[in-house]
Interface confidence: low
């Protein structure tokens, strides 16, 4: 009877969906070893946790291959939803842009956000600012307390996509005029 119980028990475990792809499986903890090429994933549900053998790791995890057993390891990249490896994100959390395997709330300098894919792409490259120009107002350099001075920069490289705007290439700021009153 004991043998029959063991045999039935094993058969029922093998047919249990949580034991799919397992090399060893228990009623309480699910899989503890997986068939070759599958990834071991420790799923948590409330206070309970059990092992599963998966063809691909769930969102937020990546497949880590090792001689003893392939495992699903958690993405440790900040604001990452799914990743290819421990330091390369493939999809960021909502509101973040993917750039070279990392997630940014704003694209780094020289890159522009592509909202449809939430990626940072090669942006518009601009040169250095010129010196501030002469302080003037309405083409005069006198007569006011305050004027505007302007500086400019050149576009060095056009952006990867036409829809990506270039940063401002001219900016002005208020400046104190050297002469309040115009001579003569």
């Amino acid at each position: 009877q004991g043998n029959r119980w063991r045999r039935n028990k094993r058969a029922s475990y093998v047919s249990n969906p949580i034991c799919k792809g397992c090399l060893s499986c228990s009623k309480d903890n699910g899989c503890s070893r997986c068939q070759q090429k599958l990834f071991f994933f420790l799923r948590r549900e409330g206070m309970r946790q059990y092992g599963e053998c998966l063809h691909s790791c769930p969102s937020g995890y990546y497949g880590h291959r090792a001689p003893d057993m392939n495992r699903c390891a958690r993405c440790r990249i900040e604001n990452c939803d799914s990743c290819f490896s421990k330091d390369f994100c493939t999809k960021c959390k909502v509101g973040f842009y993917l750039h070279r395997g990392r997630c940014f709330d704003e694209c780094p300098d020289g890159f522009a956000p592509l909202d449809e894919t939430m990626e940072c792409v090669e942006g518009c490259e601009v040169g250095h600012w010129s010196e501030w120009g002469t302080c003037s107002r309405n083409n005069r350099t006198c007569g006011f307390k305050w004027g505007l001075e302007t500086r400019t920069r050149q576009i060095v490289k056009k952006p990867a996509k036409d829809t990506i705007p270039c940063p401002t290439i001219a900016e002005s700021r208020r400046c104190k005029m050297a002469m309040r009153h115009c001579p003569g």
Partner: antibody, heavy 119, light 110 residues
Framework: EVQLVESGGGLVKPEGSLKLSCVAS????????MSWVRQAPGQGLEWVAH??????????YYSGSVKGRFSISRDDSRNMVYLQMNNLRTEDTATYYC??????????WGQGTQVTVSS | QPVLTQSPSVSASLGASVKLTCTLS???????IEWYQQHPDKSPKFLMQ??????SKGDGTPDRFSGSSSGAHRYLSISNLQLEDEAIYYC?????????FGSGTQLTLL
């Protein structure tokens, strides 16, 4: 003490005209740029028009919403600034403030005069 | 994108401090701005002009009010809030031949 007192507001029909006046005291009026700023009921502030001093040939500037319909002028001998408003629209309904314009900002304000454009 | 962006309302407690923000669009991010205060049914009052790292106040603006700047953001800080500080605060900016106002922030004291 700087004082600005507006007058000339009232009820006018659409496409009608109105001339606002502002008398200034307590400062050398001829040295100051002057502006009109308005505020529609329950809304924010909107700059309307600006006039320079004689030194700058009384140059004038207008916001896009009033350009071609409103005209700002001044009379330095009487310490007065005016806003002639023609072809008035319902959206011109607002309190109109006369302001001293230190250098493209408004450091003193009058109490305002109400303009209502309605049929 | 508006040239000047202000949050519609801010609440703070009597005696506390508050920092109001005016955000400039990218093409105006280096401009000076002005802050104005308006009490209900009263004329606006000029508070100060905020420049890069400094400000110049209007006559009668209390010491409790100060201005500062960071990137495209301009701030109006009010410390030790008093009942009379409950008002709408507008930022404004001159752009050579026109003047633009923000939509205003209603400061409510709790």
């Amino acid at each position: 003490e700087v004082q600005l007192v507006e007058s000339g507001g009232g009820l006018v029909k659409p496409e009608g005209s109105l001339k606002l006046s502002c008398v200034a005291s307590g400062f050398t009026f001829s040295d100051y740029f002057m502006s009109w700023v308005r505020q529609a009921p329950g809304q924010g502030l909107e700059w309307v028009a600006h006039i320079y001093t004689k030194t700058y040939n009384y140059a004038t500037y207008y916001s896009g919403s009033v350009k071609g319909r409103f005209s700002i002028s001044r009379d330095d001998s009487r310490n007065m600034v005016y806003l002639q408003m023609n072809n008035l629209r319902t959206e011109d309904t607002a309190t109109y403030y006369c302001t001293t314009d230190e250098d493209w900002y408004f450091d003193f304000w009058g109490q305002g005069t109400q303009v209502t454009v309605s049929s | 994108q508006p040239v000047l962006t202000q949050s519609p309302s801010v609440s703070a407690s009597l005696g506390a401090s508050v920092k109001l923000t005016c955000t400039l669009s990218s093409q105006h991010s280096t401009n000076y701005i002005e802050w104005y205060q308006q009490h209900p049914d009263k004329s606006p009052k000029f508070l100060m002009q905020v420049r890069d790292g400094s400000h110049s106040k209007g006559d009668g603006t209390p010491d409790r009010f100060s201005g500062s700047s960071s990137g495209a953001h301009r701030y109006l800080s009010i410390s030790n809030l008093q009942l009379e500080d409950e008002a709408i605060y507008y930022c404004g900016l001159s752009d050579v031949s026109l003047y633009l106002f923000g939509s205003g922030t209603q400061l409510t004291l709790l």
